[in-house]
Amino acid sequence: KKVVLGKKGDTVELTCTASQKKSIQFHWKNSNQIKILGNQGSFLTKGPSKLNDRADSRRSLWDQGNFPLIIKNLKIEDSDTYICEVEDQKEEVQLLVFGLTANSDTHLLQGQSLTLTLESPPGSSPSVQCRSPRGKNIQGGKTLSVSQLELQDSGTWTCTVLQNQKKVEFKIDIVVLAFQKASSIVYKKEGEQVEFSFPLAFTVEKLTGSGELWWQAERASSSKSWITFDLKNKEVSVKRVTQDPKLQMGKKLPLHLTLPQALPQYAGSGNLTLALEAKTGKLHQEVNLVVMRATQLQKNLTCEVWGPTSPKLMLSLKLENKEAKVSKREKAVWVLNPEAGMWQCLLSDSGQVLLESNIKVLPTWSTPVQP
């Protein structure tokens, strides 16, 4: 007996061939001997089976001695033995229909679990193997679970169902809802405008929810909510914003916040949370602000940074086109009695400059000018 595997919702073609390459009489029946379809001359006749409105054949193939039974929109319960009667012969085909579904939404938050459930006909004992978009293989029986979904799990999961040495492949598109970056850091000179961007790692037709940015300033003892907002069909509207700082927010995605001025008292870290409609849990993105200030007071030239810096970052003070006068893994450096000229304060990571502030030191009888 020939075995054919089908996928729920798909179309399957069961073949039946006669030795004579011409249109002769044929009938397809199910295991209960109920007629599904057949022919009378060049016309198609249908029986009283449950498949009536989903069964088809192709008359153009009859003249070639091929009498297919085409079943559209397959259901698990279509799994059966189908018998083709042609030329006093009986051809039996066993059809097994499988379905594979994500038993939750296919749009899942980062860190959530994905469960795939296999629907199979009674009496079958299939095995399933799924491959994630990042190449991770998982195996199982009727259910497969993946905990702690990551951003790289977004995309097409390819699952192979094996039964009777035959296989059928399912493709399931999974969208992991997350921000593109888990964390970002912005380096700014004092007084500069600060732009925070929170791009999403997914696109959906309609996006509705609400969000908030909590900020922990380095100088503050506790965190405070800087802004709350709503998201409706990808349109952003601010609900509440603090007076200091007075953040501005873009009306369209990606989520975009503007801080008018980078000041030492704002340096620190923030956590933007986004709660999406009909989803349990929230999306998070951490954002950090490092602020630099270079000042000259009397005979002391000082460079300071505020905010979450890594201990391996180097802070230097140097006169333009000269070697660094001072270079330390500290958050403040200074030079006493600096020479006149354009001084540079540099925050760097392994030689790569992250932030630079210039200050002009005038001869001692003048006051300093900050460009």
């Epitope: 198609l44 006749t45 009283p48 088809d56 054949s57 153009s60 559209k72």
Partner: antibody, heavy 122, light 107 residues
């Protein structure tokens, strides 16, 4: 002379159902399959489904499955097509058409009803 | 389902012209193809069945040809009453499909 006479025009609200009838005369009613074909304003022909008046067996285009019902009343030689969950896109002229081949599903329609305009509007 | 594509979607011709309309199937349908004529406000009328057979009562100026995927409806000498929309229809599959139609207009 074979004739297919359809029920009159209907105006329906979105979400409602409509039932159109098609009465056959001048031929052996149960010998010929009846199909329903619709035509939206300014658009082409779209096959909806077919009923075998002899067995009552039906088949439908995938697009309409779950929303369309076709029945027959052999005592009055009438077939019915009911379309549920109506939306504005269902505004069309609905035709019944008889298969030219006796006892079979040949798909060549030699006799047609005059058409029934169904308007779906809120 | 089998897709049917007609060309052109419309054409302008004069009385006496020879007019050709083509229909292409997305897969081979042998000769399981019909042609219909429809005039505004009227039900369609069967002209040709099984690709080349003229329905009774249809004038002989109408002819059909083709097999497999490519089919043609020809009107040898266009008459005033032939200005209408023409549709092809496949019946190879029991899930019938029509072409989008070709409108024949007066030049």
């Amino acid at each position: 002379q074979v004739q297919l006479v359809q029920s009159g025009a209907e105006v329906k609200k979105p979400g409602a159902s409509v039932k159109v009838s098609c009465k056959a005369s001048g031929g052996t009613f149960s010998s010929y399959a009846i199909s329903w074909v619709r035509q939206a304003p300014g658009q082409g022909l779209e096959w909806m489904g077919t009923i075998d008046p002899n067995s009552g067996g039906t088949m439908f285009a995938q697009k309409f499955q779950g929303r369309v019902t076709m029945t027959r009343d052999t005592s009055t030689s009438t077939v019915y097509m009911e379309l549920s969950s109506l939306r504005s896109e269902d505004t069309a002229v609905y035709y019944c058409a008889r298969d030219s081949a006796e006892w079979e599903l040949g798909g060549s329609f030699d006799y047609w009803g005059q058409g029934t305009l169904v308007t779906v509007s809120s | 389902d089998i897709q049917m594509t007609q060309s052109p979607s419309s054409l302008s011709a004069s009385v006496g012209d020879r007019v050709t309309i083509t229909c292409r199937a997305s897969e081979s349908i042998s000769t399981y193809l019909n042609w219909y004529q429809q005039k505004p406000g009227k039900a369609p009328k069967l002209l040709i069945y099984k690709a080349s057979n003229l329905e009774s009562g249809v004038p002989s100026r109408f002819s059909g040809s083709g097999s497999g995927t490519d089919f043609t409806l020809t009107i040898s000498s266009l008459q005033p009453e032939d200005f209408a929309t023409y549709y092809c229809q496949q019946t190879d599959s029991t899930f019938i499909t029509f072409g989008q139609g070709t409108k024949v207009e007066i030049k």
